[in-house]
């Protein structure tokens, strides 16, 4: 290559006037956080405060009732899932503040960001279990009278947690820390490298199992429940049903942006402008999904206030009232015609 005109190049975008420190950002604007990141930080802060305190309170209230009240078991497990996810927030918050720099190591990178996905799967599987329970109470009251017990509820929760852990494994396995050369930064993210098909498969499975299929089945489930409830013109309180419907609805609302951007990114070329734009919105979508981790206690309190008329009781007793309502009286195993009628009336509005 001796014949190449190998002179000092004119880079155009380089000049010789200043020096650049090792830690100086590559462009002048990168000292300030982007608007989506600032919004994500605000959401993370609120979610952490409300989520930790709210879910701790829910756990405290329901833990005492879980031995005898099945509803308490459901809400206890949901609160534990949310509480666990909230514990990762200070680390995620710190990372965003440092322009997504990840100084916490590889193990933390695999575990902490995966907690929100564990929460997603645990929550939706628990909500599916709760919804199945509501469905059976309305349509199979006699079966519930005979078999619906705390033991079965705990088994159902254990299955939900086990499945959630299994479904979170792909995300966990593909999370890696990458140390970028310039600007000097350690990043925590998923790297499928050669396997774009696997990346798409993971995104599709996440969308289908964590969103579309539950959305379809739960919509059908609650359509039937609500139709039956309205047709029977329920005389007793529908508070548990209302709370569960609100929790289910919030799940889908807050996971929607994450799921949409996730599936889009898996099908886009990583260097395309759309992909890069979506990547900038990633933290905001994650933070929006994280609202799920603090919304349930808020729903319970709002529901409790609604049922009380105004906030007369203390917060724990208000929550206890909402979360530990028992749907089936299990005093008698002998069924007469009148007992069955009573049962139907008691469960038609749950």
């Amino acid at each position: 290559m001796d014949s190449f005109n190998y002179t000092t190049p004119d880079y155009g975008h380089y000049d010789d006037k200043d020096t650049l420190d090792l830690n100086t950002p590559v462009d002048k604007t990168s000292n300030t956080l982007r608007v989506p990141d600032i919004l994500a930080l605000v959401i993370f802060a609120v979610v952490f405060l409300v989520g930790v305190l709210g879910n701790a309170l829910v756990v405290w209230v329901t833990a005492f009732e879980a031995k005898r009240t099945i509803n308490a078991i459901w809400f206890l497990n949901l609160a534990v899932a949310d509480f666990l996810s909230c514990l990762a927030l200070p680390i995620l918050f710190t990372s965003i503040v440092q322009h997504h720099h990840w100084p916490f190591g590889g193990a933390a990178c695999s575990i902490l960001p995966s907690l929100i996905l564990l929460n997603m799967y645990a929550s939706i599987l628990l909500l599916a279990t709760i919804s199945a329970d509501r469905f059976l109470l309305v349509f199979k009251p006699i079966w519930c009278q005979n078999f619906r017990g705390a033991g079965l509820a705990w088994i159902a929760c254990a299955v939900a947690w086990g499945l959630a852990l299994l479904l979170t494994i792909p995300s966990f396995l593909y999370r890696v820390v990458r140390e970028e050369y310039f600007p000097p930064k350690v990043l925590c993210g998923v790297d499928y490298s050669h396997d774009k098909r696997r990346e798409r498969a993971v995104a599709i499975v996440r969308l289908v199992l964590g969103f579309l299929w539950p959305l379809l089945t739960l919509t059908i489930c609650y359509t039937f429940i609500l139709l039956r409830t309205w047709s029977r013109r329920a005389t007793r309180s529908t508070k548990t049903l209302k709370v569960v419907v609100a929790v289910v609805a919030s799940f889908f609302i807050f996971w929607l942006p994450y799921q949409v951007t996730g599936i889009m990114m898996s099908f886009l070329e990583p260097s395309s402008p759309t992909f890069l734009l979506l990547k900038k919105l990633d933290s905001l979508c994650v933070s929006f999904a994280y609202i799920n981790c603090c919304i349930n206690p808020i729903i319970y309190v709002v529901a409790g206030q609604g049922f009380q008329g105004r906030l007369r009781k203390s917060l724990p007793s208000l929550l206890r009232n909402v979360l530990t309502e028992e749907s089936v009286v299990r005093e008698s195993k002998s069924f007469t015609r009148s007992t069955v009628d009573t049962m139907a009336q008691k469960t038609q509005a749950v």
Partner: antibody, heavy 125, light 112 residues
């Protein structure tokens, strides 16, 4: 024109230390990072690390972190690499190479635009 | 570390032929800013390497337009449209997205 003039060939014993130099001319020394690259006979290239002459901050390949020390002398526009605890595997040609730096631009110091002619280090007892 | 795999190791060509060298990385080289920091160097016998292509497809100052680069993520290619005698030597791909910076094992372009 840009020149990176490296010191002459070195012969050292196993366990000894050596200090290689790279004198820069034809550009503002403090505006370019200086990298060091190793090439063993008939083999590929291996990155050792870099130094920012302006701030004296440096970054090393973990593989060389304990044995390589990069320094600069701004007054003479010279970069140095001190290599300690030499082994036979250290026998190689060592290159210094500069990278252009960005100012208010999205381009970074990502490629070696000029290389020194190389210094041959032979480790032999 | 990112492993850079070059193929072929040796590429015998006739002058005026087209030549293509492939470089594959063990990890994605897409930087958080969207760029792929993949570069190509040519080393002639007894000389130091010289920069040909930077950031996948940008020809360095003085490099003829018969050299072109392409690729993204993990798969990259250097193409020489009409090989000339001065193009012979060992071609190295190199990545500077991640630390440590790494190089391919080299592809020797030689006369058939």
């Amino acid at each position: 024109q840009v020149q990176l003039q490296q010191s002459g060939a070195e012969l050292a014993k196993p366990g000894a230390s050596v200090k290689l130099s790279c004198k820069a001319s034809g550009y503002t020394f403090t505006n370019y990072w200086m990298h060091w690259v190793k090439q063993r006979p008939g083999q590929g290239l291996e990155w050792i690390g870099y130094i920012n002459p302006s701030s004296a901050s440096s970054k090393y390949n973990q593989k060389f972190k304990d044995r390589a020390t990069l320094t600069t002398d701004k007054s003479s526009s010279t970069a140095f690499m001190h290599l300690s605890s030499l082994t036979y595997e250290d026998s190689a040609v060592y290159y210094c190479a500069r990278v252009p730096l960005p100012y208010g631009s999205s381009y970074g110091p990502y490629f070696f635009d000029f290389w020194g002619q190389g210094t041959t280090l032979t480790v032999s007892s | 570390d990112v492993v850079m795999t070059q193929t072929p190791l040796s590429l015998p060509v006739s002058l005026g032929d087209h030549a293509s060298i492939s470089c594959r990385s063990s990890q994605s080289l897409i930087h958080s800013n969207g760029n792929n920091y993949l570069h190509w160097y040519l080393q002639k016998p007894g000389q130091s390497p010289k920069l040909l292509i930077y950031t996948v497809s940008n020809r360095f100052s003085g490099v003829p337009d018969r050299f072109s680069g392409s690729g993204s993520g993990t798969d990259f290619t250097l193409k020489i449209s009409r090989v000339e005698a001065e193009d012979l030597g060992v071609y190295f791909c190199s990545q500077s997205t991640l630390v440590p910076l790494t190089f391919g094992s080299g592809t020797k372009l030689e006369i058939k």
